[in-house]
Every structure is written in C-alpha cells, then in structure tokens.
C-alpha cells in the first residue's frame, strides 16, 4: 500500500544530482511503490514517473484528480489520476478535464451556454476574476472570466480553495463544497487519523490558518481517544 508514502512527504529515489549531493551522502530522498490497478498490472513508470499520493484534488496537477486507483479501493490510499475526458463517467466536477464538468455522472463541456444554466442558481460570485492559471494551463474550474468577477465569498459554491476569497477555503458542506473561513487560533479543528479519511465528512472544516496547527487541546489529554478535542494552536 501507499500508507508509508501518505504518512511521509519525503521524496526519495531521485536521479542525480538532486538525489544526494556531495557532502550529504544520506540525502537520497522514497517514491511511491508501484500501484496495483485492476487486472493486477503494476503501475508502469514512464521516465521514472511515480504516482503522487494525495488527500485532495487540489494537491494534484491541473489535469488530475485525487482518488483511489482501484475501484472500491482503500479510501486511505489515494493518488493523483489523469482527469476524465468528455463523455467519460464521473462522480464530481474535479474528475473531468479542464473545460468540462460532471453532469449526471458524465463529463460534459462547460462552455458558457451549458454551464451557466446548470449552476447559476446555486453559485453567487463563486469564482475568481481570471481563470487562466499563472502557468498558462486552464484550470478545471474555468467557466469564463466574463461570468464571475470576484473570488467566492463565505457560503459561495466552489470546487477548490483558490476559488475562494482570502481567508476562506473550499470545504465540503452536505454534498457540495462551499467557501468557509480558515480556522483561527483556539477554534476546533479536525485531525484526521489517516490521510483520506476526510472524504467521509459531510461538514468539512477548513484547515488552521498561517502559523497554526491542529493539536489536542491541552486539558483534553486525559480524555478518551474518541472525545479528544483538537484546536488550532500556535506552532
């Protein structure tokens, strides 16, 4: 499994010169092992390509989404997978390639005429003023810069945190995702026992703000495991 990789962000088995520079013999930094796909074939590496372990779509490339590589696979083992092209099956928008969105389980074109009617009722000021990314790739959230002019405010529907205004993140709320405030010092946060477990949350909290981390509240150390309260605390 990828558990060891999911629990460690170390990058290893790098080609020289990055793998271990002179003076740092122990600096070789371990990539994900081969992933088993349906049919049992090991993940084939191309140019030493190693799948990237992830917990959220936003951690992946612009043309990828985060999911378990096997149908019905362990929810804790997720990697970035290639996005689905038009007319392919999908379960959420992020699974579809840029320029498409998920409608009735199928990736369809998100050109202005299709998309505006579909989600206009539920989105208010949801997306940023320019949806071309800095690196020149169109994002999966691209709708049209003419359609939406401000970053999503609190409560706006979103696909990823970059769709939300500063101080907000994109988090699950029932079966959609909305912009919610990034957590402040002292606020209750969710500490996931294993990566990927937040996929089960219906009401997802944002992450802790800059300089804060989600830790057990000091006076809750004695409490039972299940009732331990985590709050955002200074590093």
């Amino acid at each position: 499994t990828l558990n060891s990789v999911l629990n460690s962000n170390a990058i290893k088995n790098l080609p020289p010169p990055l793998g271990g520079a002179a003076g740092h013999p122990g600096s070789a930094v371990s990539a994900a092992p081969g992933i088993l796909y349906p049919g049992g074939n090991k993940y084939q590496t191309i140019d030493n390509y190693q799948p990237y372990p992830c917990a959220e779509d936003e951690e992946c490339g612009t043309d990828e989404y985060c999911a378990s590589p096997t149908r019905g696979g362990d929810a804790g083992v997720q990697i970035c997978l290639a996005c689905r092209k038009r007319r392919k099956r999908c379960m959420r928008h992020a699974m579809c390639c840029p320029g498409n969105y998920c409608k009735n389980g199928i990736c369809v074109s998100s050109d202005q005429n299709h998309f505006r009617g579909e989600i206009e009722e539920t989105i208010t000021e949801s997306f940023g003023n320019d949806h071309s990314t800095l690196d020149g790739y169109s994002r999966r959230t691209t709708l049209s810069s003419k359609m939406y002019h401000t970053k999503g405010q609190e409560g706006s529907v979103c696909l990823r945190s970059s769709d939300c205004a500063s101080g907000l993140c994109c988090a699950r709320h029932f079966w959609s995702k909305i912009c919610k405030p990034v957590l402040k010092e002292g606020q209750v946060c969710t500490k996931h026992r294993r990566k990927g477990s937040h996929g089960l949350e219906i009401f997802q909290r944002c992450y802790c703000g800059e300089g804060l981390s989600c830790r057990i509240q000091k006076d809750h150390h004695q409490a039972s495991n299940s009732s331990r309260l985590h709050t955002c605390q200074r590093h």
Partner: nanobody
C-alpha cells in the same frame, strides 16, 4: 517584472538556528510551488524543501527532515525556511524558486530544479564549527 528576493542568511555556529525568507513580487504565487535549493561551492544546486500550492503539502530531502521547516504566507507572498541544528555541511548559497502547478504531477516534481521557472539571487548561509 517577477522577482524573488531572499534574505536572512548569515554566519552562524554549528547547532544554531536561522530563518530564511523569500519575498515574491510582480505576480501572485498562490498557484506555484515554492522551494529552497542550496548550492555549495563547486557543487550542483540541490533540493532541500518545497511547499506546494496546496498549503498542507511540504516536501523535504531526507537529510534535513526534522531540522528544516518550510512555510508560506500567500497574503504576503512570502516563503520561510526555518533551519535548526545547523551543520557545517549546510553551508551554501540558498536559492528560493517557484514552480508552476503542472498538468500532471509525480513524486519527484518538487525536487526537480528544471520544474522551477523563477529563481532568486540567493542568500549565503555559512555554518562554522
């Protein structure tokens, strides 16, 4: 004009701590990964730490894990590298760099120098024994 400016370098004793700062201007870098790459005299520039566009993900070379910590503040367009328990072999010019979010990502993306489009001028860190 896009610029990355490093600061915070200096001369310290082995075992000391130092925090390097990198400030970006001319563009917002929230859709970029930011990394630190030291280069010792006569050696290749190497990867030590990176933080992705998704704030939760940090990546480190094994030899600095537990000693170095990278963080970013997108509102201020700043990336910090907190270095502790410094060793003489950490002596190098430390470069800050920015890599765009790619179409496809692999495990080695953050550690590969050629993926980084923008580079600072570097800040010298010298650790004496």
């Amino acid at each position: 004009k896009v610029q990355l400016v490093e600061s915070g370098g200096g001369l310290v004793q082995a075992g000391d701590s130092l925090t390097l700062s990198c400030t970006a201007s001319g563009r917002t870098f929230d859709n970029y990964a930011m990394g630190w790459f030291p280069q010792a005299p006569g050696k290749e520039r190497e990867f030590v730490a990176a933080i992705s566009w998704s704030l939760s993900r940090t990546h480190y070379a094994d030899y600095v894990k537990g000693r170095f910590a990278i963080s970013r503040d997108n509102a201020k367009n700043t990336v910090l590298l907190q270095m502790s328990s410094l060793k003489p072999e950490d002596t190098a010019v430390y470069y800050c760099a920015a890599a765009p979010r790619p179409k496809r990502i692999s495990v080695s993306y953050f550690s590969t120098t050629s993926n980084y489009d923008y580079w600072g001028q570097g800040t010298q860190v010298t650790v004496s024994s």
